[in-house]
């Protein structure tokens, strides 16, 4: 097979001869050198499937259901290509799978049973296998064959395309379950007709039906939709306020030399040449021979999956919960109301065995898992490998972008007992240098630079947002001589100083030696000229406190706050002398899990928080000398949010901004997968 | 400081048994958790039991109901009864305690334990 040859897979006679047809018409317009077009014929998608992970072919567009196949072992296929529909300005990927209801009705999604429901059709993604998977636990046993047990769990439904004589109840809305449009209750549009007409309670659509059959707000304004955390929302709010996001239409590849850049490579020019109103002889997204043949008609055109999205992101923890559940058909021992053990992200095997130890004290209600990175373990929370973990306030912005919600505040200064319920105002981000040196903030161009980790507050979003104002570019590497700012490209100048050992050398874990608010100000004793850390850094690590080798010596005094002014004042005068205020740290987790963690949270350090007071013969979940595992070490209490229970609310408006702004600058690739 | 010793691995066909020893070259008494890990060929060390000092025990779901740790503080001695032995509960096998922080990657020199027919 030639390197730049695509093999994409058709599906039937059609497919094959359309496929034909765009092999020969990229072949006219492509170099000989560019990407091409090679066509195999398989009798299925799944075969499909099958034929990409054998490596018998490279491409196929898949539905969602089959984007699920694809991803499952011995498969292993990843999204490359995504189709969006729309405009080129507000392309849309993924539609929204809601539960809309009647605002006069006074039930939530938990109080479903007994109700009245109008369903798409059978087997349909948001009229059927989103919802009923969801609903799936709360089925009454047994829950096979699948239809008799939803046919008793509401008092009546209209499914389309249901078999009438065998589940009677299905069709009690719409007789004879009509499995097309001479059903006026059929599809989307009849869905919502079902609701409309008050023959249903509850209808489940897409997001954009009610948009499509309701042009007057104050119409729109006389529903509302059914959220997973048993609340409601206003219709225009399905962002928040949804059973699943379900991806279009989408092109998969292998995981592992799947030819991704070469498939994007292909569709782009195919898009550029023959896409929406291009050609007269080839159109992409239309067919003499059939509907939907390689692609949907409906398209306007492909996006490039950020590499990041891995098929567990792009299909979504919901979706994959629903659809898991009807595959597999099976559900929790437990009932669905008790709290499970919470999985506890920790950073690489140091974190790993203070969780290890808290898991043992916590007589098994937390659970450990790894990763290598905060974005890893921000992903595993996402897809529900992992439920909660502590972040930095930058963290927590990209935490909260991802869908993630803040459960609980580190907190520093409050004493007991009123600490679980303070919310503090944060801490000082401060740049220290050494008092021998003549460092100012005016003067560090060509210095040498300490950050605990690209992407956290102290360490880089607030003196890199500062210094972006400033040199109106993201070259930090070329502003700075060297550093270490631990998760930069392992060949920038920001890795040159980094202790490592080789392997981990510039990892954002603690294995690099210099990483975190320690390893930071570590950097600035042996071999920088600046550090940017948290206000109680220096004295945390001085006058014996930290009893490391290199820093068991170390003296408060020899160190300086860099201020804004151009002055340098004591390290004892943090509040007169910071780069900017700094959200706490905080506990993050999907919104579905946040009241167990949460609770779970608050008896833990009740048992095992600062009110121990000998951590040498008993665990201590706060303490790691020095090391800020899990949590900071300086953390009195995990405090209640109140009101503060959104990211954007957590973090608040000006941090939220600068964060925004620093964005131009971003490297995070889960970030660009989450904004996707 | 503690130091700790495995013994007690060693060849056995599945379904058989084995219990493993640590023994400490002091008092463990006023130690809080101890526990034993595992590490595969080409796998990452991974927690199997733990125990804490008042007898709350914590165990990896793999080996829940086939495996027992406990602790004898005047022996200054940790367990891990197996039965039950599976072919992938092939590994080295360590104890640790904890007591050094989570910083230091110490550990001894683990007991070999093979399940094979």
């Known amino acids: 097979v030639p390197e730049k040859s695509v093999r994409w897979c058709a599906v039937s006679e059609h497919e094959a001869t359309k496929c034909q047809s765009f092999r020969d018409h990229m072949k006219s317009v492509l170099p000989s050198n560019g990407p091409s077009v090679a066509c195999v014929k398989k009798a299925s998608h799944l075969d499909c499937i099958r034929a990409i992970a054998a490596n018998e072919a490279d491409a196929v567009t898949l539905d969602a259901g089959l984007v699920y196949d694809a991803y499952l072992a011995p498969n292993n296929l990843k999204p490359v290509v995504a189709e969006f529909y729309g405009s080129k300005e507000d392309p849309q990927t993924f539609y929204y799978a809601v539960a809309v209801v009647k605002k006069d009705s006074d039930f939530q999604m938990n109080q479903l049973r007994g109700r009245k429901s109008c369903h798409t059709g059978l087997g349909r993604s948001a009229g059927w296998n989103i919802p009923i998977g969801l609903l799936y636990c709360d089925l009454p046993e047994p829950r096979k064959p699948l239809e008799k047990a939803v046919a008793n769990f509401f008092s009546g439904s209209c499914v389309p395309c249901a078999d009438g004589t065998d589940f009677p109840q299905l069709c009690q809305l719409c007789p004879g379950c009509g499995c097309s449009t001479l059903n006026q209750y059929f599809s989307y549009s009849g869905a919502f007709k079902c609701l409309k007409d008050g023959a249903g309670d509850v209808a489940f659509v897409k997001h954009s039906t009610i948009f499509e059959n309701l042009a007057n707000k104050a119409d729109r304004d006389q529903y509302e939709l059914l959220c997973l955390d048993n609340t409601r929302k206003s219709v225009d709010e399905y962002k928040d306020c949804h059973l699943a996001r379900v991806p279009s239409h989408t092109v998969v590849a292998r995981s592992v030399g799947g030819k991704e850049d070469l498939i994007w490579e292909l569709l782009n020019q195919a898009q550029e040449h023959f896409g929406k109103d291009k050609s007269k002889e080839f159109q992409l997204f239309s067919s003499p021979h059939g509907k939907d043949l390689l692609f949907k008609d409906s398209a306007h055109g492909f996006l490039k999956v950020p590499p990041r999205m891995d098929a567990k992101m792009y299909l979504g923890y919901e979706y994959i919960t629903a659809i898991r559940n009807l595959r597999e058909g099976t559900c929790p021992e437990a009932p669905t109301d008790e709290c499970k053990p919470v999985k506890w992200c920790a950073l690489s095997h140091h974190e790993r065995l203070k969780c290890d130890e808290w898991s043992v004290n916590s007589a098994g209600k937390i659970e450990c898992e790894s990763a290598e990175t905060t974005e890893d373990c921000i992903a595993k929370i996402m897809n529900g490998e992992a439920d909660a973990m502590s972040l930095d306030g930058g963290f927590v912005y990209i935490a909260g972008m991802c869908g993630l919600v803040p459960v609980l505040a580190e907190n520093y200064n409050t004493p007991n007992p009123n600490c679980e319920n303070t919310a503090e105002e944060g801490y000082f981000a401060v740049a220290v240098v050494k008092s021998s040196s003549d460092l100012t903030w005016d003067n560090l161009k060509g210095k040498k630079s300490c950050h605990t980790a690209v992407g956290r507050t102290a360490g880089w979003n607030i003196p890199m947002g500062l210094l972006y104002s400033k040199i109106n570019h993201c070259r930090f590497d070329e502003f700075f001589s060297e550093g270490c700012a631990p998760g930069s490209e392992k060949n920038s100048s920001l890795c040159k100083l980094c202790m490592g050992p080789s392997p981990n050398l510039c990892e954002p874990n603690n294995k690099e030696g210099y990483y975190g608010y320690t390893g930071a100000f570590r950097c600035l004793v042996e071999k920088g000229d600046v550090a940017f850390v948290k206000h109680q850094t220096v004295p945390q690590n001085t006058g014996g406190k930290n009893p490391d080798a290199w820093a068991k010596n170390l003296k408060e005094e020899d160190y300086e706050l860099l201020c804004l002014d151009g002055s340098r004042k004591s390290v004892q005068e943090p509040a007169n002398c910071h780069l900017a205020r700094a959200p706490n740290h905080a506990v993050v987790a999907r919104k579905d899990k946040a009241d167990c963690v949460q609770t779970l949270l608050l008896d833990q350090q009740r048992m095992f928080g600062s009110s121990v007071t000998d951590c040498s013969s008993n665990f201590c979940l706060f303490e790691s000398k020095t090391k800020d595992l899990l949590f900071r070490d300086d953390t009195v209490c995990l405090a209640k949010l109140h009101d503060r229970n959104t990211y954007e609310k957590y973090l608040g408006e000006e941090y939220v901004k600068a964060v925004t702004n620093l964005r131009k600058c971003s490297t995070s690739p889960l970030l660009e997968a989450c904004t996707f | 400081e503690v130091q700790l010793v495995e013994c007690g691995g060693g060849l056995v066909q599945p379904g058989g048994s084995l219990r493993l020893s640590c023994a400490a070259s002091g008092s463990i008494a006023s130690i809080n958790t101890m526990a034993w890990y595992r590490q595969a060929p080409g796998q990452q060390r991974e927690l199997v039991a733990g125990?804490?000092?008042?007898?709350?025990?914590n165990y990896a779901d793999s080996v829940k109901g086939r495996f027992t740790i406990s602790r004898d503080n005047a022996k200054n001695t940790l367990y891990l009864q197996m039965n039950s032995l599976k072919p992938e509960d092939t590994a080295v096998y360590y104890c640790?305690?904890?007591?050094?922080?989570?910083?230091?990657?110490?550990w001894g020199q683990g007991t070999q334990v093979t399940v094979s027919s």
């Open positions: 125990i804490t000092r008042g007898g709350s025990t």
């Open positions: 640790t305690d904890y007591s050094r922080g989570y910083y230091q990657d110490y």
